[in-house]
């Protein structure tokens, strides 16, 4: 009932709680002397469903049959309307429409850990929309029945707060859940299980790893488990991997040897436990243990390349370069590289340890036969040395690869292609493609990149250390025994017109012609490989088209003669530079007047 109902009553038949689809009779009746004061025939009783008027009647009582009520709670209010006054609330009633509970399904129980508590879950089925009480019962082998009730609206879980013991792990327990509301009751099918079926062990803890004699091949994983655990599964992976290695072990007693770990690798380890071969469930995975395996001596050999530079008639500079070993080859932190330089005929050898660099430069006589060996060392030992005989890499003209081309291939890639040398192509043992940023000064500090290609390949895609809008000097070497031939080309992955033209720094007169000198365009403004320079000139104050002279770009060139100027005429000169994408803006303008005699 909604309020004190002093003036009358609202009764509901058959009940305030009804099954969906049922009909109810609602009666509103006034108590004696509670009608309209002047004329009781004027009593007008009105029945509201929530705020909507659904029926009215003149007199002391009103009967209304109501059908089609929705699931949930519906509020009915009866009011009295008298002439010349507001409606007065008489009484009200709530009607609860719902359904009987469905049979609870999929009842299952679990105990987390040997010391945990038994809890069960089930599926309620469709919502009853009514207050429904669930009672969970558990009968055990000790002739005790446990019972717990739940009065939440959405009850599908109960914890008994007790702990099943493994005194007789094969003894049966039976659980059953019963749902009861005003419209009926329903019980689940009984669920019968043993201790071993429902106990889910706690995840293992205190995980440790030991490496005997600091060796990756003698590795044991240790952990602690609950007392009854029979099975474990281990999973482990390198920290940078998504794929797990899995191992199942029986009666491990908290230890297991791992035989397939890689050296100098951080691994993540996790363990899970189970009480029985085919009963029960696996525990959650343990917290991860992260550990790094010990180093082993490096495997593999360094990829070594070199560059020779003529210094003077008796000396040459040798620059050695090598690539880092891959992580799987280094098998530890590389502490230093050992470089040995030896003159083969005289047997003189010099060894040096290099730390922090992957290159080494030295000066040697131009005479003699020289060889180098380079190896990488970590705390456990050294890699096998890579041996190279120093030779003149471009000496054999007949070994020079032909028709070398370099073309942009997508973002920051250059496809280099060539034809085999004229000399017997089968003599080629390997090709080496080398590239470095083009610097007009021929700076030897510029990093060198290279890749090796099999003798039957006639192309290579270079992508390492390739930047857009930078010109690269690319060489293809064909190597055969102690001979080599090479061809070179310039290439870029992406280009556009240069950002500026060359800066003319001097114009000098020589025997009736002039020599123009300029400063190179800064590398970052070249925007790719330069193909040509253009020198423009025209008479000062003239509106005629300028004349021009186009010069093929050569790295070291920074002057050029022009002999078509008239004496005693003042000219304005400027320069531009071109890539395959177009021409730069003008460089600076210079005026010049040739002093020589007129022809």
């Amino acid at each position: 009932k909604i309020d004190a109902c002093k003036r009358g009553d609202v009764t509901v038949k058959p009940s305030h709680v009804i099954l969906l689809g049922s009909t109810v009779n609602i009666t509103c009746s006034l108590k004696p002397r509670q009608g309209c004061f002047h004329y009781s025939r004027r009593n007008k009783l009105i029945l509201y469903k929530f705020d909507r008027r659904i029926n009215f009647h003149h007199g002391h009582s009103l009967n209304s049959q109501v059908t089609g009520l929705p699931l949930g709670t519906t509020l009915f209010v009866c009011k009295l309307a008298c002439i010349n006054s507001d409606e007065i609330q008489i009484c009200g009633a709530e009607i609860f429409v719902g359904v009987a509970p469905e049979q609870p399904q999929n009842l299952s129980c679990i105990q987390k850990g040997e010391q945990g508590t038994v809890a069960c879950t089930w599926e309620r089925g469709r919502d009853t929309h009514l207050y429904t009480e669930y009672t969970l019962q558990l009968s055990g082998p000790k002739n005790l029945t446990w019972q717990k009730q739940c009065k939440d609206i959405y009850c599908d879980y109960l914890d008994f707060g007790i702990n099943l013991t493994p005194e007789s792990p094969e003894s049966n327990f039976t659980a059953k859940v019963t749902a009861v509301n005003s419209l009926g009751s329903s019980s689940s099918l009984p669920s019968t299980f043993t201790f071993l079926d429902i106990v889910r062990p706690l995840p293992p803890w205190d995980i440790r790893i030991k490496f005997q004699k600091a060796s990756v091949s003698r590795c044991t994983l240790y952990w602690r488990d609950e007392g009854l655990v029979l099975l474990n599964r281990l999973r482990y992976r390198p920290s940078n991997s998504r794929l797990w290695n899995m191992v199942n072990v029986t009666k491990a007693k908290g230890r297991h040897d791992l035989l397939d770990l890689k050296p100098f690798t951080e691994y993540e380890f996790q363990i899970s436990s189970k009480l029985h071969l085919y009963k029960g469930s696996w525990s959650d995975w343990s917290e991860s243990l992260r550990a790094q395996t010990p180093e082993e001596e490096p495997t593999g050999m360094l990829d070594v390349w070199y560059m020779k530079r003529h210094i003077d008639y008796s000396r040459q500079q040798i620059s050695l370069f090598w690539k880092n070993l891959s992580v799987s080859e280094a098998r530890g932190k590389i502490l230093h590289y050992q470089v040995t330089l030896q003159e083969l005929t005289g047997g003189k050898a010099m060894t040096q340890n290099i730390t922090g660099h992957t290159s080494w430069t030295t000066v040697i006589p131009r005479t003699g036969n020289w060889a180098v060996a380079v190896s990488a060392a970590n705390s456990k030992g050294s890699s096998l040395p890579t041996r190279i005989n120093i030779m003149n890499l471009c000496e054999a003209g007949l070994l020079a690869p032909r028709q070398v081309s370099a073309n942009s291939e997508g973002m920051d890639n250059i496809l280099v292609t060539w034809q085999p040398p004229r000399k017997d192509p089968s003599a080629v043992q390997e090709y080496v493609v080398e590239w470095r940023e083009l610097h007009p000064g021929g700076d030897t500090q510029v990093p060198l990149n290279w890749l090796r290609s099999r003798p039957y390949n006639v192309s290579a895609l270079i992508s390492e250390n390739i930047k857009s809008y930078i010109c690269y000097e690319i060489r293809v070497y064909a190597l055969s025994g102690d001979q080599g031939g090479c061809s070179s080309i310039l290439g870029n992955s992406k280009h556009k017109a240069p950002l500026s033209g060359p800066h003319i720094n001097a114009i000098t007169e020589e025997k009736g012609s002039i020599l123009i000198s300029w400063n190179s365009i800064p590398v970052q403004e070249q925007m790719g490989c330069l193909l040509h320079y253009r020198i423009y000139w025209k008479e000062r104050d003239s509106n005629s088209q300028p004349q021009l002279c186009e010069i093929p770009y050569r790295v070291s060139q920074n002057s050029h003669p022009i002999n078509s100027l008239q004496p005693r005429v003042t000219y304005v000169l400027w320069m531009t530079a071109l890539t395959a994408a177009g021409e730069s803006s003008h460089g600076n303008e210079r005026e010049f007047c040739l002093q020589g005699k007129a022809n």
Epitope: G140, K142, W146, K148, F160, N163, T165
Partner: nanobody
């Protein structure tokens, strides 16, 4: 020290009912569990029923299931044992027991009298045929 006081025992005819009550001198919330045990002459003490105070889990011997029930009623420090359809073999001294604090008890522990640490004097129930 928790004192437990049983009442409600007596003589009853077979098929009759009794309601035993156990009043604790401390609030029952301070206790982990309260239970009823019985001991017939010449027999061992056996569990009848109990209740875990915090979660409201009840436990009852399968021999008495359907005839006996345990509840806390409305009184904060009292538990009741409702006994219906009594039989002559239900004749025994009925004692109230309490466990003040605990970790999670096991199903075995909770049915054993030694697990409980406070006991009442007991009340006699006699069922005549």
């Amino acid at each position: 020290q928790v004192q437990l006081q049983e009442s409600g025992g007596g003589l009853v005819q077979a098929g009759g009912s009794l309601r035993l009550s156990c009043a604790a001198s401390a609030r029952t919330e301070s206790m982990y569990a309260m239970a009823w045990f019985r001991q017939a002459p010449g027999k061992e003490r056996e569990i009848v029923a109990g209740i875990i105070q915090s979660g409201g889990t009840t436990y009852i011997s399968d021999y008495m299931k359907g005839r006996f029930s345990i509840d806390r009623g409305n009184a904060e420090n009292t538990v009741y044992l409702q006994m219906d359809s009594l039989k002559p073999e239900d004749t025994a001294v009925y004692s109230c027991a309490a466990k003040v604090s605990s970790g999670t008890p096991s199903d075995i522990q909770i049915s054993q009298s030694r697990w409980y640490d406070h006991w009442g004097q007991g009340t006699q129930v006699t069922v005549s045929s």
